[in-house]
Amino acid sequence: MMTGTIETTGNISAEKGGSIILQCHLSSTTAQVTQVNWEQQDQLLAICNADLGWHISPSFKDRVAPGPGLGLTLQSLTVNDTGEYFCIYHTYPDGTYTGRIFLEVLESSVAEHGARFQIP
């Protein structure tokens, strides 16, 4: 039975040209995390494999930095980066847990962070 929950940074906003950290945390399970995939709608941004470390998709090599931890740092943000981001935890023996983050990239200098929330 899948007992874990994923806590994410929820709905967040950031300034155009700036950077943002996407973070998820898996709790309430003893399952072993074998890999975490970071995806943006229909694109893969990065993979963190428990044994090998990070893989960054070629399209994002100039703008994505691994970490902190299992998180992902997006740099040089554009308005096109606005949208849904998913952290997909591959675990054994539980299976797959998915967390969702919505990022809004703002033209203005006011960019507030939203509240944290959980996805079972």
Epitope: L44, G53, A65, P66
Partner: antibody
Framework: EVQLQESGPGLVKPSQSLSLTCSVT????????WGWIRKFPGNKMEWMGF???????SYNPSLKSRISITRDTSKNQFFLQLHSVTTDDTATYSC?????????????????????WGPGTMVTVSS | DIQMTQSPSLLSASVGDRVTLNCKAS??????LAWYQQKLGEAPKFLIY???SLQTGIPSRFSGSGSGTDFTLTISGLQPEDVATYFC????????FGGGTKVELK
């Protein structure tokens, strides 16, 4: 040009250990990621495991209890040991390089594909 | 495990033909796919990464396309030296390979 060459016995008895060596020229095994892949009769291929630039390892879960990959950086070689072999382990064994990339954060990241391979060595498990 | 299925298993074509090889993943792998060429008795040769990016030094008659679950390797004008077995490999979740497509001359 990066070149890899596998070597080791072509015949191993059931229940014994299979030991293979991959000798690398044109690249240091202290960089990039180095893997073993095998092709069974009938063409099915299986990734077996990696040793990384730092010496850490990653193994196919289906082989985890039987496999060991080590290296000797002074000889620029890495090694495969597969224990308790059966006739199902009869295959052509190849070593290969998976290249790495240095990220913005100066971390080494794996690329996922194998850009240089050895020609492979056929290993038969039979009594 | 993600399963990779290649079709056809055998393809016969003439020199100059446009040849299309298919690779299907059992679930979405985005574009994390590589293609290789292997001639009899030789080491595999790396052709394409990230589904459509040509490795340096590979002739431009080779091209890759696709994303998600369906991928294609195209040889735009088959040459005698292209006779080989071609296989795909995913690197989205672990590393798994297709069964290969053997290309021969008619």
């Amino acid at each position: 040009e990066v070149q890899l060459q596998e070597s080791g016995p072509g015949l191993v008895k059931p229940s014994q250990s299979l030991s293979l060596t991959c000798s690398v020229t044109g690249s240091s095994i202290a960089s990039d990621y180095w893997g073993w892949i095998r092709k069974f009769p009938g063409n099915k291929m299986e990734w077996m495991g990696f040793i990384t630039y730092s010496g850490s390892t990653s193994y196919n879960p289906s082989l985890k209890s039987r496999i060991s990959i080590t290296r000797d950086t002074s000889k620029n070689q890495f090694f495969l040991q597969l224990h308790s072999v059966t006739t199902d382990d009869t295959a052509t064994y190849s070593c290969a390089r998976m290249p790495s990339f240095i990220t913005l954060a100066s971390l080494s990241t794996w690329e996922g594909y194998f850009d240089f391979w050895g020609p492979g060595t056929m290993v038969t498990v039979s009594s | 495990d993600i399963q990779m299925t290649q079709s056809p298993s055998l393809l016969s074509a003439s020199v100059g033909d446009r040849v299309t090889l298919n690779c299907k993943a059992s679930q979405s792998i985005h574009k994390n796919l590589a293609w290789y060429q292997q001639k009899l008795g030789e080491a595999p040769k790396f052709l394409i990464y990230y589904a459509n990016s040509l490795q340096t030094g590979i002739p431009s008659r080779f091209s890759g396309s696709g994303s998600g679950t369906d991928f294609t390797l195209t040889i735009s004008g088959l040459q005698p030296e292209d006779v080989a077995t071609y296989f795909c490999q995913q690197y989205y979740s672990g590393w798994t390979f297709g069964g290969g497509t053997k290309v021969e001359l008619k």
